[in-house]
């Protein structure tokens, strides 16, 4: 039961995370005009990965897409790429994990296949979450750098007569959505990987039967290999239980470091 719950919860958490990553990628508020010195402004600027917007105090909002590809900063392109890779991997991971869910029966799919698919989707979710976190963090770093640069030369005077106030940008809502969503996807992926451990068929609970060949004493242990999930291949000193072997749902899952994002 615990494995099914872990897998199901991992799927749901990842689903929420990927939905968040998609939402963050589409949002216009990646960077918003810094209002620290002027909390009320007649013109409010904010920018996303795909377009920049201006909201006037009149309520009128105007958005303009970045219609150039080559003219955009490399960092912005990199962030776009990371977010898209995260979404694509996450979407594939979701598709794979649907078929891997223990509660869904598809033909005569073996548990070993489900375990493999669970692990695959888990890894995809982890990479997807990392892509999102990396993308958002790169953008945040870019903002911090630009913020202090524009603070250093906040006013660029023309002969000391005319002042041009530079618009400073700070973290927008999309960054926080992205960080949380990336973290959730990552946690979901870890949960799927943990669930995979329990999904893999345990060694059969038969007593070892010994066959004595002439001259040599060889013990043949039937069902001695786990599905090659990467977690439980038959290593030396593996104990074969006489009885009371743990059921797949009793496999203990330990808290991951990612549970404390």
């Amino acid at each position: 039961m615990a494995v099914t719950a872990c897998q199901g919860l991992g799927f749901v958490v990842s689903l929420i995370g990927i939905a968040g990553i998609i939402a963050a990628t589409c949002m216009d508020q990646w960077s918003t005009q810094d209002l620290y010195n002027n909390p009320v402004t007649a013109v409010f600027n904010y920018q996303g990965l795909w377009r920049s917007c201006v909201r006037e105090s009149s309520g009128f909002t105007e958005c303009r897409g970045y219609f150039t590809l080559l003219g955009l900063p490399a960092m912005l392109q990199a962030v776009r790429a990371l977010m898209i890779v995260g979404i694509v991997l996450g979407a594939i991971g979701l598709l794979v994990s649907i078929f891997a869910l223990k509660c869904i029966r598809i033909g005569s799919m073996e548990d070993s296949a489900k375990a493999n698919m669970t692990l695959t989707s888990g890894i995809m979710f982890i990479v997807s979450g990392l892509c999102a976190i990396a993308g958002v963090s790169v953008f945040a770093n870019m903002l911090v750098t630009n913020f202090w640069m524009s603070t250093a030369n906040m006013y660029t005077g023309m002969g000391g007569m005319v002042q041009t106030v530079q618009t400073r940008y700070t973290f927008g809502a999309a960054l926080f959505v992205g960080w949380v969503a990336g973290g959730l996807t990552l946690i979901g992926g870890v949960m799927m990987c943990i669930a995979c451990r329990g999904l893999a068929p345990e060694e059969t609970n038969y007593k070892a039967v010994s066959y004595h060949a002439s001259g040599h004493s060889v013990a043949y242990k039937p069902g001695g290999f786990k599905a090659s999930t990467g977690f439980g291949s038959n290593t030396k000193n593996k104990k074969i239980y006489d009885g009371g072997a743990r059921t797949e749902d009793e496999v203990q899952s330990y808290p991951s470091k990612h549970d404390y994002v």
Partner: antibody, heavy 118, light 113 residues
């Protein structure tokens, strides 16, 4: 058609309070902010501030903080300007104006003349 | 506060003439976010409320004759009236609508010879 109709002229004594109204018609009142502009006799225009007809949140120019208060009666599509503790220098024409795109004022009230005299 | 300086303070013209009036701001009114200049021009005739002519420095309000043209960017703006007519005699105000408070210029009075 869009109209902003202001109340009639006012004659007040120093220290008194006046409440000027601006009734909007011909459009959805809560979609456009309302600005208040003062024009002293023979002088130029001075922006006093504006009120969001959607949230009711007012924004005042520094010079008009304190004695001046913007308010709304949304059900009646009416904006109000209240001036407390009137002074002689408050004698002016007060306009209400609708805030539209470009942060410009496309429709104006006819103006109300306030005279403060002892 | 952004200070708006209009010049000349008054202008005497003959009908059919081309007129230009200037408006300078102490800070740039250009917003890089949408590449627009937040400057508005109004016309006020005696005993009347102001009338919106131009917004975003160069966008003519609907119903305004095309002889009125707004130009300029950043801190320097111009209102041009080609072939002035008698009905154009009024005071013209420019207004900063980029930063609070939304300050007006002192106005340019257009008079007929």
């Amino acid at each position: 058609q869009i109209q902003l109709v202001q109340s009639g002229p006012e004659l007040k004594k120093p220290g008194e309070t006046v409440k000027i109204s601006c009734k909007a018609s011909g459009y959805t009142f809560t979609k456009y902010g309302m600005n208040w502009v003062r024009q002293a006799p023979g002088k130029g225009l001075k922006w006093m501030g504006w009120i969001s007809t959607n949230t009711g949140e007012p924004t005042y120019a520094e010079e008009f903080k304190g004695r001046f208060a913007f308010s709304l009666e949304t059900s009646a599509s009416t904006a109000f300007l209240q001036i407390n503790n009137l002074k002689n220098e408050d004698t002016a024409t007060y306009f209400c104006a609708r805030l539209v795109r470009g942060n410009s004022f496309d429709f104006w009230g006819q103006g109300i003349t306030l005279t403060v005299s002892s | 506060d952004i200070v708006m300086t209009q010049s000349p303070s008054s202008l005497t013209v003959t009908a059919g003439e081309k007129v230009t009036m200037s408006c300078k701001s102490s800070q740039s009114l250009f917003n890089s976010g949408n590449q627009r200049n937040y400057l508005t021009w109004y016309q006020q005739k005696p005993g009347q409320p102001p009338k919106l002519l131009i917004y975003w420095a160069s966008t003519r309000e609907s119903g305004v004759p095309d002889r009125f043209t707004g130009s300029g960017s950043g801190t320097d703006f111009i209102l041009t009236i080609t072939k002035v007519q008698a009905e154009d005699l009024a005071v013209y105000y420019c207004q900063n609508v980029y930063s609070y408070p939304l300050t007006f210029g002192a106005g340019t009075k257009l008079e007929l010879k």
